[in-house]
């Protein structure tokens, strides 16, 4: 679809005659037929095929024809056509003289012709004008012309219908051959399918709009390349949805068991050395000068009485110190400027002289102890104390506080968490170092033996002769059900025959 | 050839949500060439678009409903369904479920048999 | 919101050509369809694109789209051809459909 457009821009005919010679009277009021028609190598007078198009009286004799295509669009002339277009045409233009107002064919005498002319040739579709001028003995006649497409219509043609649009069935201008341009953010045959935000996944993200990313299920982030793990998943990760991969350290359906407390909480403190021992259990090995379980209860160095001879010792940063009494001196006041004369023995222990009297030792009666017999025995010297009890003093006696899961006098026992028989039906404790175990008698399951489990009595085929074995489940006996000619409680027997009793 | 078979039932209540399927048979709903469509017909009347979706899930509605209206896509059954919520006697018609294609530009080359929905009490 | 209007009834005596016309705002830029709905049946596309026939519908069928108005033109119009139809147009995402005209 287009139209072949014809511009009139001058018509010269200076005497005011028409085609017979004879002049107009007053003057030749002039007009124009214009036939359009299919190439033809000899123009002939015939059909316009391609359409026809008149104008009014445009003027007398010689005149200049004005552009009008605002006011009303009578120059160029338009000849529209419903067709691809055929790149070749054969044109016929008339100027006539209107004695009246009525300018159609019939109602005007044969004579009243001023001249025609025809051309034809090759025209292609474009936007550029034609400049011709044709001139008889008497006129000369100045117009362009050119073929444009229609609306929508494209190609070198006209036979592309393309419109530009920008809803869900395509986002496109037209190129000037007729195929679709996308606009920014569109792609596909039709400009349909949006352009992801650059690195969408291809398979787990789409969008509706250009640069967007939404995700599929089971998959999010930004360029929904990260899968999400099972809901409830704590410390695990996943590589296809819906998975829960534990971390290092983490164990369970969830991810949520921890497997490396001392990596996840360092709780042994003061520089202690942590092991794991199973499912949140450790141990802190502590180092000198540090006890309690977590390793956060600091040792005096006085504790463990380094002074002697009723030496008083003082805690320093960087270790102890000893205030010896009267008489001694040395680190832990261990050397004596005292013989026996000078009575050094305390609580009733007796002096011996040593070295030609340079020197004594004292014998200390029972619960004395020391170079002077000046300390009484501490009983947590020994470190009485097993499996990490804390020895504490408690006057003449001592005791040990014992750690979980131990008990006894020297915490020497592990506490049995079989001694509360927690095994159900009678089943039978195994004591473990993390727990219990329980070993079920026959019909029972379960970590403590508490779901009863159907015993199947007839896994063993008690019933003969091909009978039908059924379970009594509240007896957990059989029951045969026997086939026509036998019976017996396992149908072992046919029918006719009697038991053969011992009695 | 592609079919689409709409289900659901006949008669709804007023002020109730009005639920239908398009079952489509023969092609797969995936194909990036077609939007699919929910057309209907009040009896006697003409022809009003509700809405359509792509198989991605992206869906367009006429304003005049679009705060009742909800077309889903189920590509692994190869369904689509429209909900109508707060549905009166004006929405008694004819539903369609249409292939709007876009190699046709839009036009819809392909249809259901259409079922009646009644809205009464 | 856009509108197509349509003829209600379009009379026409066999072998005689139907035309009718589908009228909106700027419609020629818009791409325009033409569905065939007989009494008791679904509807049935028979032009798309303006003027382009799907496979298996007559050559009688045509459309032409300029202006503000659309035609579909029956030639030679046959007993068979009685029916309603329905112009239908996009705009701006949404879907609509002229009034119908009844063709007898």
């Known amino acids: 679809s287009g139209v072949f457009q014809l511009q009139l821009q001058e018509f010269i005919n200076e005497r005011g005659v028409l085609a017979s010679g004879r002049p107009c009277e007053p003057g030749c009021r002039t007009f124009f037929r214009v036939c359009l028609k299919h190439f033809q190598a000899v123009v002939s007078p015939g059909p316009c095929t391609f359409g026809t198009v008149s104008t009014p009286v445009l003027g007398t004799n010689s005149f200049a024809v004005r552009d009008d295509s605002s006011g009303g669009g009578r120059n160029p002339l338009q000849l529209p056509f419903n067709f691809t277009w055929p790149g070749t045409f054969s044109l016929i233009i008339e100027a006539w003289h209107a004695p009246g107002d009525d300018l159609r064919p019939e109602a005007l005498p044969p004579d009243a012709l001023i001249s025609k002319i025809a051309i034809q040739g090759s025209l292609a579709v474009g936007q550029n004008w034609l400049l011709d001028e044709q001139t008889s003995t008497l006129t000369r006649l100045r117009y362009s012309y050119r073929v444009i497409c229609s609306d929508n219509y494209y190609g070198d043609n006209c036979s592309r219908l393309c419109k530009k649009r920008n809803d869900h069935f395509g986002h496109y201008v037209c190129q000037p051959d007729g195929n679709l341009s996308c606009l920014p953010g569109w792609t596909g045959e039709y400009c349909q399918q949006p352009i992801c935000l650059s690195g969408c996944h291809e398979q787990n993200g789409y969008c509706s709009k250009p640069a967007e990313c939404l995700c599929r299920p089971g998959w999010q982030g930004r360029l929904c390349n990260e899968c999400i793990p099972h809901n409830g998943c704590r410390h695990g990760t996943c590589s296809t949805p819906w998975q829960c991969t534990c971390d290092e350290g983490w164990g369970g359906l969830f991810c949520d068991q921890d497997l490396n407390y001392c990596t996840h909480h360092s709780p042994c403190k003061n520089g202690a050395t942590c092991s794991n021992s199973g499912q949140r259990s450790y141990t802190c090995t502590c180092r000198p000068g540090y006890t309690g379980v977590d390793c956060e209860l600091e040792l005096s160095e006085c504790d463990s009485n380094p002074c002697r001879n009723g030496g008083s010792c003082k805690d320093q940063e960087d270790g102890y110190h000893c205030l010896c009494p009267p008489g001694y001196y040395g680190l832990h006041c261990e050397h004596s400027t005292l013989s026996c004369a000078d009575s050094p023995c305390f609580n009733g222990g007796s002096c011996r002289e040593r070295n030609q009297g340079a020197n004594y030792a004292c014998e200390c009666p029972p619960n004395f102890t020391g170079s002077n017999c000046e300390k009484k025995v501490d009983r947590c010297t020994s470190n009485p104390c097993a499996n990490g009890g804390q020895c504490l003093n408690r006057g003449p006696s001592r005791m040990c506080r014992c750690r979980p899961g131990f008990t006894g006098t020297y915490c020497e026992l592990h506490v049995s968490d079989c001694a509360r028989n927690p095994c159900a039906h009678g089943g039978t404790c195994h004591d473990l170092e993390n727990g219990l175990m329980c070993t079920c008698p026959a019909g029972f399951s379960g970590r403590r033996c508490e779901v009863r489990t159907s015993i199947d009595a007839c896994a063993s085929s008690p019933c003969f002769n091909r009978a039908t074995c059924y379970t009594d489940l509240s007896t957990d006996t059989f029951v045969c059900n026997c086939p026509y000619g036998f019976v017996g409680s396992r149908c072992e027997f046919p029918v006719g025959l009697p038991p053969s009793f011992p009695w | 050839e592609v079919q689409l078979q709409e289900s659901g039932p006949g008669l709804v209540k007023p002020s109730e949500t009005l639920s239908l399927t398009c079952t489509v048979s023969?092609?797969?709903?995936?194909?990036?060439?077609?939007?699919w469509g929910w057309i209907r017909q009040p009896p006697g009347k003409g022809l009003e678009w509700i809405g359509d979706?792509?198989?991605?899930?992206?869906?367009y509605y006429n304003p005049s409903l679009k705060n009742r209206v909800t077309i889903s896509v189920d590509t692994s059954k190869n369904q689509f369904s429209l909900k109508l919520s707060s549905v009166t006697a004006a929405d008694t018609a004819v539903y369609y479920c249409?292939?709007?294609?876009?190699?046709?530009?839009?036009?819809?080359?392909?249809w259901g048999q259409g079922t009646l929905v009644t809205v009464s009490s | 919101s856009y509108e197509l209007t349509q003829p209600p009834s379009v009379s026409v005596s066999p072998g005689q050509t139907a035309s009718i016309t589908c009228s909106g705002e700027?419609?020629?830029?818009?791409?325009v369809s033409w569905y065939q709905q007989k009494p008791g049946q679904s509807p049935v596309l028979v032009i798309y694109?303006?003027?382009m026939r799907p496979s298996g519908i007559p050559e009688r069928f045509s459309g032409s789209n300029s202006g503000d108005t659309a035609t579909l033109t029956i030639s030679g119009t046959q007993p068979m051809d009685e029916a309603d139809y329905y112009c239908?147009?996009?705009?701006?995402?949404?879907?609509?459909f002229g009034s119908g005209t009844k063709v007898t």
């Open positions: 249409a292939r709007e294609s876009v190699p046709l530009g839009g036009g819809a080359d392909n």
């Open positions: 023969g092609g797969s709903i995936s194909s990036g060439s077609y939007y």
């Open positions: 979706i792509y198989y991605t899930g992206s869906t």
């Open positions: 700027s419609l020629g830029d818009k791409y």
């Open positions: 694109e303006d003027s």
């Open positions: 239908q147009a996009w705009d701006s995402e949404v879907g609509v």
